[in-house]
Interface confidence: low
């Protein structure tokens, strides 16, 4: 009897997701079975299914079976949260690029490499043909997209609607181009999903046909993701378990990228004189072992045969025969010289103190000329002398060049958060340094509060309770979604970048978040011809102890009557006391039959001696936060709109004057809210927004 | 699980030894081998996965093999010397999806190789 | 890749406590895949604990395991007449990418 085999590595799985259709025309087909692999089976078999099914869910509860002739990307289709249902995608359908000689591509690309848009198979204009779908069942030759039914060399491609051309392939990229891997690959999260000789993967959340320690659970950070290919274990590249029974695991091909900097997740805190942590990111000169014998050369196998070689372990810095850390080791060691001894630990070498020495500044740090040189983040500061061009372009006068030696950290641009510097990473352009103000220095940054001396104008889930329905312009308000569920509130302050709340990440994967725009509905319920549904490319931190974020997302909002920014205050301007500012927000209102609608609170401003004072002198308020109290008792932002806004008008302008962040109760009467002053960090958000790339639409 | 085969040998014959269980699907369990010289420790020679696919330490490698059938282990030692002589032991190694240790949690009772001249 | 077992033998008396260290050569061993195996005279080891500190089925608590990376404990509390055996550790490293065990010297523990 032949092994059928198993398809689910086929398919893409979204945890805890399932998908509901919208528009009623879209069939579905149920049936009671025992496993997700059944399901699997079926649907790429399309045995029994009155249509091509591109995706099913699993109902672990039920143990049934939805298969789909959709999948989340088609429209009349949206996502939902649910424990049990798992769905699982067939890859075909959504990846953007093409395996071999792209036979099983069935993306939506539909435009041939010259630009000419391709002529739907299922029409004889303006070239007949006999590439009908009825003759090539299987091969998805739907609409007018690229296909490649007969696996010609080339590609997939399509009759063209230019009837001087007849046909012509499409310019899809091999997979093995689009991905690359920085380093060893370690923190590589792509979708190479076959290694170098072609055997498809096994999925990470299966034992079979190779049992494995490598358990999704186990190990959430290393991005164990369906049958992808990863470096979970300091390997000199991503590999996987093959679907091979005699061939237990292989390398992938995925190239090293163009720009081979270091991702901005789990970069090591490069030290040169002492070990910070496991000292993975020691790059000194000690090269004896704590005993004074010498180490031997990483690129020398003699006298110890080794595979710790730097062509193995690039991004590890194996240079000489200097002692370093490159698999996680408990400290930096080396390979020794003398044959009898294969390793050591280099227990000489000094644990680092973390607060720097006496190393702090005074005011804003304008004048720090310490000698850090490194971000709070770990990166290594770039030299100032390379990066002059970009700082003129965000500072409008002369920068001290004599203050700006080497690559310390300094703050040429009067930035009110500290010494910062560039780091040469062009995903992360520049950073604060880990320098504190100094012990009882309390010269403010910015200087009375209290007193309107700027104009603000220019020419547990917090939620809001007990307020009334909105539904006027407010369409830079922001959904974040985590695992497909409302988390938390946003405020869109450019077409890329949301403003929200450092507690709303409650997991490092981007992929767990999206952020939905042109919303009324927490649900997107009567939104679907106005919603955006963007992915989060990035995240920003705010300044230490500023609870902010910036979010960047993957592509640029597009901006229209549902959605739209919101401006921001000018730097360090108060808003006068008793100013009418209301506050947004989804989640738990008070309301038993709660509605799921954006409710809107309104607020009035309060000064800070006098909102210490309601907090019954238990909080000292200090420059970078602002308050404001409910005009209704009992009304005001709640555990669950973290992130959202605080928005107040001045001269017919609204503005984001105030983050909602947890931590200082929930809607209790005669306690005012106290809220992150978006004024004092203004300068920051306008500095990230000028230095950090964004996608183009 | 009850390992049998071990006996006298002189060196250089070869011998095999057969686990045979009983209540364990072997297409469901990874199975190994371990071994006891007289008065030593515990010394870890390889395991066979549900698949058949068999994974060897250093020092075993190429002078023993192991295989199976649907109810049974075997390890062949293909070239012994007096330095093989030990009880072998035959284990189940732990299957809860949850861990990630290869824990051996059920043991045969051994069997005795000598191998002498 | 060598396990050390440290002290042996260790005596301990009844109701008394025992403890035994387990150190890696290297901490290239998947963190907290360890074992701990309790063998008496004439007889198989019995799994005692997996996954660093797990407690196998049937096995009273008062044997209780810890540690990560190199280091790792048994630790023994209330000791009994029957605890008198050899205790074994055993960890996992990466061959590749396959998985190889190996196992510690042994630690007798003698109870008075």
């Known amino acids: 009897q032949r092994k059928r085999r198993n398809t689910i590595h086929e398919f893409k799985k979204s945890a805890k997701t399932t998908l509901i259709k919208i528009d009623p025309a879209l069939k579905i087909k149920t049936k009671k079975v025992n496993t997700a692999d059944q399901c699997a089976n079926r649907c790429t078999r399309n045995k029994g299914l009155p249509f091509t099914c591109k995706a099913f869910v699993f109902d672990k509860a039920r143990k049934q079976c939805l298969w789909f002739p959709f999948n989340s990307m088609s429209s009349g289709v949206k996502k939902e949260f649910g424990h049990e249902f798992d769905l699982y995608e067939n890859k075909d359908y959504i990846r953007n690029c093409i395996i071999g000689k792209g036979r099983s591509y069935k993306g939506t690309v539909s435009i041939t490499k010259s630009g000419i848009k391709c002529q739907p198979w299922s029409s004889m204009i303006p070239h007949e043909h006999s590439f009908l779908p009825s003759s090539y069942r299987g091969k998805d030759l739907q609409e007018n997209y690229c296909r490649n039914p007969r696996g010609e060399e080339g590609g997939p491609w399509c009759f063209t609607s230019n009837p001087e051309v007849r046909y012509e392939v499409c310019d899809i990229p091999q997979c093995s181009e689009v991905e690359c891997m920085t380093c060893n690959g370690e923190s590589y999260r792509g979708l190479m999903d076959h290694t170098e000789s072609g055997k498809i993967c096994q999925r990470w959340d299966h034992q079979t046909p190779h049992r494995h320690k490598f358990l999704p659970e186990r190990y959430p950070d290393k991005g164990f993701d369906d049958n992808y290919c990863r470096n979970p274990d300091g390997q000199p590249r991503p590999w996987c378990y093959t679907l091979d029974p005699h061939t237990r695991w292989e390398y992938c091909a995925i190239k090293t990228c163009a720009d081979n900097t270091m991702n901005d997740t789990d970069v090591p805190l490069e030290t040169t004189e002492c070990i910070q942590g496991q000292g993975e990111g020691y790059r000194g000169t000690v090269n004896t072992i704590w005993n004074g014998i010498p180490c031997q050369r990483w690129d020398s196998q003699y006298p110890h045969e080794h595979d710790m070689t730097p062509e193995n372990f690039k991004c590890k810095d194996l240079r000489e025969n200097y002692c370093r850390n490159p698999d996680g080791s408990e400290s930096p060691w080396c390979f020794t010289t003398d044959p009898n001894i294969r390793v050591g630990y280099c227990s000489q070498i000094p644990n680092c103190d973390m607060s720097h020495g006496q190393d702090c500044y005074r005011g804003n740090g304008k004048n720090y000329m310490g000698n850090l040189s490194q971000t709070r983040s770990g990166l290594t500061c770039s030299m100032w002398d390379k990066n002059m061009e970009d700082l003129h372009r965000h500072i409008f006068w002369e920068p001290d060049a004599s203050k700006l030696n080497e690559n310390y950290c300094r703050n040429p641009d009067d930035d009110a958060h500290g010494p910062w510097c560039y780091t040469g990473n062009p995903l992360i352009p520049w950073d604060y340094c880990p320098i504190s103000r100094c012990e009882g220095d309390t010269t403010p940054t910015i200087v009375n509060l209290d007193h309107p001396v700027i104009s603000c104008a220019k020419t547990k889930q917090l939620r809001v309770v007990n307020g009334i329905p909105t539904r006027t312009n407010i369409g830079w308000m922001v959904s974040l979604r985590y695992r497909n569920k409302h988390i938390c509130g946003g405020s869109l302050i450019k077409e890329s970048w949301v403003l929200t709340a450092r507690q709303c990440f409650p997991s490092r994967d981007l992929k767990d978040y999206e952020a939905w725009l042109g919303i009324h509905d927490v649900h997107g319920r009567g939104d679907e011809k106005c919603k955006q549904v963007l992915n989060v490319s990035q995240l920003v931190y705010g300044p230490e102890g500023s609870d902010l974020v910036l979010m960047k997302l993957a592509r640029p909002a597009v901006l229209d009557d549902f959605v739209s920014t919101i401006d921001l205050p000018n730097y360090g301007c108060t808003i006068p006391e008793k100013t009418s500012c209301s506050v947004y927000g989804w989640g738990y209102t008070g309301l038993i039959n709660y509605d799921g609608l954006l409710r809107v609170a309104h607020l009035y401003i309060m000064g800070n001696e006098k909102c210490s004072q309601h907090h019954r002198g238990k909080v000292t308020l200090n420059e970078s936060e602002i308050c404001a109290g409910a005009e209704k008792i009992g009304s005001g932002p709640c555990e669950g709109d973290y992130g959202g806004p605080l928005v107040c008008e001045q001269h017919k302008m609204r503005m984001v004057l105030g983050v909602i962040v947890p931590g200082r109760g929930c809607a209790i009467p005669n306690r005012p809210g106290i809220f992150v002053r978006v004024a004092y960090y203004a300068k920051w958000i306008h500095k990230i927004i000028l230095t950090y790339k964004v996608p183009q639409s | 699980v009850e390992e049998s085969g071990g006996r006298l040998v002189p060196p250089g014959t070869p011998l095999t030894l057969t686990c045979t269980v009983s209540?364990?699907?072997?297409?469901?369990?990874?199975m190994g081998w371990v071994r006891q010289a007289p008065g030593k420790g515990l010394e870890y020679i390889g395991m066979?996965?549900?698949?058949?696919s068999t994974y060897y330490a250093d020092w075993a490698k190429g002078r023993l093999t192991i295989s199976k059938t649907p109810t049974t282990v075997d390890l062949e030692i293909t070239s012994p010397t007096t330095e093989d002589t030990a009880t072998y032991f035959c284990?189940?190694?732990?299957?809860?999806?949850?861990?990630?240790?290869?824990?051996?949690?059920?043991w045969g009772q051994g069997t005795l190789v000598t191998v002498s001249s | 890749q060598v396990l050390t077992q440290t002290p042996s033998p260790v005596s301990a008396a009844v109701g008394g406590t025992v403890t035994i260290n387990c150190q890696a050569s290297?901490?290239?061993?998947?963190?907290?895949?360890f074992s701990w195996y309790q063998q008496k005279p004439g007889q198989p080891p019995k799994l005692l604990i997996y996954?660093?500190?797990t407690l196998a089925s049937g096995v009273p608590s008062r044997f209780k395991g810890s540690g990560s990376g190199t280091q790792f404990t048994l630790t023994i509390s209330g000791v009994q007449c029957g605890d008198a055996a050899t205790y074994y550790c055993?960890?996992?490293?990466?061959?590749?990418?396959?998985?190889?065990?190996?196992f510690g010297g042994g630690t007798e523990v003698v109870v008075k």
């Open positions: 284990a189940r190694l732990i299957d809860e999806r949850s861990t990630y240790s290869y824990a051996f949690d059920l």
């Open positions: 209540g364990i699907d072997l297409s469901s369990y990874a």
């Open positions: 066979i996965d549900v698949s058949g």
């Open positions: 290297q901490s290239f061993y998947n963190n907290g895949a």
């Open positions: 996954d660093a500190s």
């Open positions: 055993q960890g996992e490293f990466s061959c590749g990418s396959a998985d190889c065990v190996a």
